[in-house]
Interface confidence: low
């Protein structure tokens, strides 16, 4: 390509007339501000191209970038495309315009930027001050392209005199964009609402100051458009948030709320996706099994676990025998209610130090305006069995009795043995169980009676060995669910002058 | 209906103390986070302090830590805030709110109070 004036730099007068002329062996056309001009085209005989761009009554508003190139779809090199650069100075033009685009500058990294204030005079001095500043900035100037820098995120205008005159230029914005990939988070005041309940949804990204939302969501499939509302979270910087309210949701509400967003700088996309529900009313539900009849061991803490599903949030109260229970002042009682998930609850009745009195019937009771459930069972305190009496007497009839009395919840079973060698007894020699067989010329007579009050069984076993000729080691064991205790006499016969 | 009901504002000396309680009624009452939040004329409401039912979890906002704590009566259904070393920046409409969120938006609570004025002079 040849142009004519070569250039690179021109300067001409204001009014005047100026032809610009590019040759070149394919078609070639003249472009001003990606724009092609008026201009005559030629082709000469032999077969070089020319384009003639003619410029007639010049003003400052004709300075400006000049390019010659070829005019057909193949891909150009770089010498195949010419610059020029025309200065019209013209004391009626100051700066040169802006687009409106020109005037906010967006970064997204540390980097050069041209603040394009250009004035149509090369012999100009421009200086470059903050917008409320009157100190020159300390950046090179290029008449061609303007102030270029590191710049702080401000607002910067360019001065220039001419003549008598100062002539200020645009505000121009520099903005420092955060731009990094995107993590979406979506999240819902409740996943689960009430029909009439409000749906109200975030989708918040962070680490962007540049992104788009998109929601789509059940009623946006059948046309009903919901408005989102966007904003910036100021006690977080780069959090952004949409948010999504639905007034009155409808059951047909019910469904997934997908949240994309699109970072416009990279390019960069990420979407996040909530189930809801929406019910007709709102309800209770057990989960899991709580057996009717539950056990607690004497002066041991207890605690007792009810789980369940609930909107809207219920309350929840434990009743003993139909009495309303609440945290004892005395700490023998702790009752909470865990919020485990949005909607799932564990209620927890605790008794600290068991005590007989304890023992009943336990209900608890969650509701709420909708829907209520209630879960009751049996409280049985478990006492470990003592043994409270073991006694030897022998009544006239001839034959000797052994007493053995005991307490204890559950009832205790009651088991007798007996060993006759004293001296290997019952370390060598196992002992023999008792009552179960005629052999041992014993009879056994057991009675058990329950105790309201202290509610607990009590056993009366007495046992009658027809004769004893020589001393016996006689034991008494009682036996529970939670343990055993046991005792043990000596029986000596009757001709024998001691007893042990 | 849920009602929440603020109690104990005044004016107090910089340095002095106040304790806000907050009675809530209503039959159904059940949120599980109760919080405190504040005014001044032509500003947003801004958070104070929340506390879970268990009370096993508060959260307090910067300005205020160190100096207020939240505390609740569950046999009362009441939420009590004890604002000790008072500033004059400290001076606004106390809110009580009641919500199943600790959270500092406002959003997240279903149910608030009418308010009580806090007052402190320099």
């Known amino acids: 390509l040849v142009v004519t004036p070569p250039g690179p730099e021109l300067v001409l007068n204001v009014s005047s007339t100026f032809v610009l002329t590019c040759s070149g062996s394919a078609p070639v056309v003249w472009e001003r501000m990606s724009q092609e001009p008026p201009q005559e085209m030629a082709k000469a005989q032999d077969g070089t191209f020319s384009s003639v761009l003619t410029l007639t009554n010049l003003t400052g508003l004709d300075t400006g970038e000049y390019f010659c190139t070829h005019n057909d779809s193949r891909g150009l090199e770089t010498d195949e495309r010419k610059r020029l650069y025309i200065f019209v100075p013209d004391p009626t033009v100051g700066f040169l315009p802006n687009d409106a685009e020109e005037l906010f500058i967006f970064l997204t990294e540390i980097t050069e930027i041209t603040i394009p204030c250009r004035v149509t005079d090369p012999q100009l001095v421009v200086t470059l001050h903050e917008k409320k500043g009157d100190v020159a900035l300390p950046v090179p100037y290029d008449h061609q392209r303007g102030f270029s820098g590191i710049f702080e995120d401000r607002s910067y205008i360019c001065k220039t005199t001419i003549g008598d005159r100062e002539v200020d230029s645009d505000a121009y914005y520099v903005y420092r964009l955060q731009v990094s990939s995107i993590n979406v988070s979506v999240n819902a005041v409740q996943t689960v609402v009430r029909q009439g309940e409000n749906i109200t949804l975030m989708c918040i990204v962070i680490g962007n100051e540049v992104v788009n939302f998109e929601w789509t969501y059940p009623r946006k499939e059948s046309g009903r458009l919901v408005e989102p509302v966007t904003d910036f979270l100021l006690d977080m910087p780069y959090h952004i948030r949409s948010i999504l309210h639905i007034p009155s949701a409808e059951l047909e509400d019910s469904g997934t709320y997908t949240c994309n967003v699109t970072e416009s700088v990279n390019d960069h996309q990420d979407e996040k996706a909530i189930n809801i529900t929406v019910v007709e009313s709102g309800y209770v539900r057990l989960l899991g099994e709580v057996g009717t009849l539950q056990f607690a061991e004497l002066h041991r803490s207890r605690t007792l676990q009810v789980v369940f599903e609930a909107y809207p949030p219920p309350t929840v109260l434990w009743f003993k025998d139909n009495r309303t229970l609440g945290d004892s002042s005395a700490g023998e009682i702790a009752l909470s209610t865990r919020n485990v998930s949005e909607t799932r609850y564990v209620s927890e009745l605790t008794l600290v130090r068991v005590k007989v009195a304890e023992a009943g019937h336990y209900t608890m009771r969650a509701f709420h305006e909708d829907a209520e459930v209630q879960l009751s069972f049996q409280l049985q305190i478990n006492v470990p069995v003592r043994v409270l009496e073991l006694s030897e007497s022998h009544p006239d009839s001839g034959e000797q009795t052994v007493r053995c009395r005991g307490r204890g919840m559950p009832q205790p079973n009651i088991i007798w043995s007996a060993c006759r060698d004293l001296k290997r007894c019952p370390r060598e020699l196992p002992p023999t169980l008792l009552g179960n067989s005629s052999e041992e010329e014993s009879q056994l007579e057991t009675n058990v009676t329950y105790w309201e009050e202290e509610q607990e069984f009590e056993v009366v076993s007495t046992l009658r060995l027809q004769h004893v000729d020589r001393p016996l080691s006689v034991r008494c064991t009682l036996r529970n669910a939670v343990g055993q205790d046991t005792q043990e006499v000596i029986v000596v016969p009757h001709s024998l002058p001691f007893k042990v | 209906e849920v009602q929440l009901v603020e109690s104990g504002g005044g004016l107090v000396q910089a340095g002095g103390s106040l304790r806000l309680s907050c009675a809530a009624s209503?039959?159904?009452?059940?949120?599980?986070?109760m919080g405190w939040f504040r005014q001044t004329p032509g500003k947003e409401r801004e958070f104070v302090a929340a506390?879970?039912?268990?009370?096993?979890?508060?959260h307090y906002a910067d300005s205020v830590k160190g100096r207020f704590t939240i505390s609740r009566d569950h046999a009362e259904n009441a939420v009590f805030l004890q604002m000790n070393s008072l500033k004059p920046e400290d001076t606004a409409v106390y809110y009580c709110?009641?919500?199943?969120?600790?959270?500092?938006?406002?959003?997240?609570?279903?149910?608030w109070g009418q308010g009580t004025q806090v007052t402190v002079s320099s």
């Open positions: 709110a009641a919500g199943n969120y600790l959270d500092t938006a406002q959003y997240r609570y279903n149910y």
């Open positions: 209503g039959r159904s009452f059940s949120s599980s986070v």
């Open positions: 506390t879970r039912w268990t009370a096993a979890s508060t």
